[in-house]
């Protein structure tokens, strides 16, 4: 009866999902079979977020707006470690939009989930952020310092990183 | 004031190449991105180019991307716009005008009077 | 590309009257609150010269007889009383998203 119930349940909040994500990869979390965690596929999973990389092409708003019908937004990074995930899956030769912005010009960078912009867990290029005029943040590749950030116009398409909470049911 | 001044335009073969030039004064042009904006005759504007302050970040919409190049001397106060491999529907007056962003937009707030590239044989 | 198309393409207004030119785009042009759609009045002759930004505010040193309304993809120029020196090309465009795209003009002119 118990396990009939959590059965029920997993399915009730699976169909919410499936509106934006038909389909869910999931896996067993630690020893107990009641836990499992989940993330769209194909996105890839680390710690407790989902990832999706974006290929199409947007403006940074449009590229927000894109996460947001998938029930995410633009990446937040949040320490080296993370950042190290996510470089594994990009490609060396594209610029990919990150949650992150200054809307007003004033180095006031602020991300999309208002998550506290900490000076001390940035990976800007050297001589990055250099313009007032350039308000987004990517990451890209560059030969001499590996993977890092840089401003550039919002407007400009770019390819994009979608963050989600894992789903558990 | 702000001035923008552009030159350069003429009368060119199919397959030419141009150069074109915008002086400003009244500006601090250093910190300032900078576009190019084209009107043929009789249609709507179409945007043509634009480079940031310091010079590293350009952008082009298809329709020029590899034939046109924007750039830059701060230290003469100038913009300038080569055009390569001139097709007749590259035929307008060209404009450059300074950039102001808004939030995550834009507006192109100060225009030059122009000048005419015409591509014919 | 977002496509802007104004209506109508022109305009006979008599002076002092009100002039309402409008500006559909092919997707949305909105963002937190803000929308990134521009007007510029051309002159035969001139360059464009900037009206209004972000839809509804009035760039310095125009008079406030320009307005501009509008959300998501329907925006409006309004002209409160039209006069003599208003007779131009008028022309929407919206920088959300590179390429930046014009609207075909709408040229107004005097009954």
């Known amino acids: 009866n118990f396990m009939y119930s959590k059965t029920v349940k997993r399915l009730s909040k699976l169909r919410e999902y499936q509106q934006y994500h038909p389909s869910l990869t999931c896996v067993m979390e630690g020893k107990d079979i009641e836990d499992w965690s989940c993330c769209p596929t194909p996105w890839t999973s680390f710690q407790s977020s989902c990832y999706f990389i974006s290929t199409g092409m947007q403006s940074w708003t449009k590229s927000q707006k894109n996460c947001s019908v998938m029930g995410a937004d633009l990446v937040v990074i949040n320490t080296r470690e993370e950042q190290d995930f996510i470089i594994q899956n990009l490609k060396r030769n594209s610029s990919y939009f990150l949650g992150l912005s200054d809307p007003g010009g004033r180095r006031h960078w602020q991300w999309v989930d208002q998550t506290p912009y900490n000076e001390n867990v940035t990976f800007w290029h050297s001589g990055e952020p250099n313009n007032l005029d350039e308000r987004c943040a990517i990451i890209n590749f560059r030969s001499s310092e590996e993977w890092g950030w840089n401003d550039i116009h919002c407007h400009v398409p770019q390819k994009s990183i979608c963050k989600m909470k894992k789903i558990y049911i | 004031e702000v001035q923008l001044l552009e030159s350069g335009g003429g009368l060119v073969q199919p397959g030419g190449s141009l150069r074109l030039s915008c002086a400003a004064s009244?500006?601090?042009?250093?910190?300032?991105?900078m576009s190019w904006v084209r009107q043929a005759p009789g249609k709507r504007l179409e945007w043509v180019a634009t480079i940031n302050s310091g010079g590293d970040n350009t952008y082009y919409p298809d329709s020029v991307k590899g034939r046109f190049t924007i750039s830059r001397d701060n230290s003469k106060n100038t913009l300038y716009l080569q055009m390569n491999s001139l097709r007749a529907e590259d035929t307008a007056v060209y404009y450059c005008?300074?950039?102001?962003?808004?939030?995550?937009?834009?507006?192109?707030?100060?225009w030059g009077q122009g000048t005419t590239v015409t591509v014919s044989s | 590309d977002i496509v802007l198309t104004q209506s109508p393409d022109s305009l006979a207004v008599s002076l002092g009257e009100r002039a309402t030119i409008n500006c559909k785009a092919s997707?949305?042009?909105?963002?937190?609150?803000?929308?990134?759609v521009n007007w510029y009045q051309q002159k035969p002759g001139q360059p464009p010269k900037l009206l209004i930004y972000?839809?509804?505010n009035l760039e310095s040193g125009i008079p406030d007889r320009f307005s501009g309304s509008g959300s998501g993809t329907d925006f409006t120029l309004t002209i409160s009383s039209l006069q003599a020196e208003d007779v131009a090309v008028y022309y929407c465009?919206?920088?959300?998203?590179?390429?930046?795209?014009f609207g075909g003009g709408t040229k107004v002119e005097i009954k």
């Open positions: 997707q949305s042009v909105d963002y937190d609150g803000n929308s990134y």
């Open positions: 009244g500006i601090t042009f250093s910190t300032y991105t």
């Open positions: 465009q919206q920088s959300d998203e590179d390429p930046w795209t």
């Open positions: 005008a300074t950039y102001r962003p808004y939030y995550y937009g834009s507006v192109l707030d100060y």
């Open positions: 972000g839809a509804s």
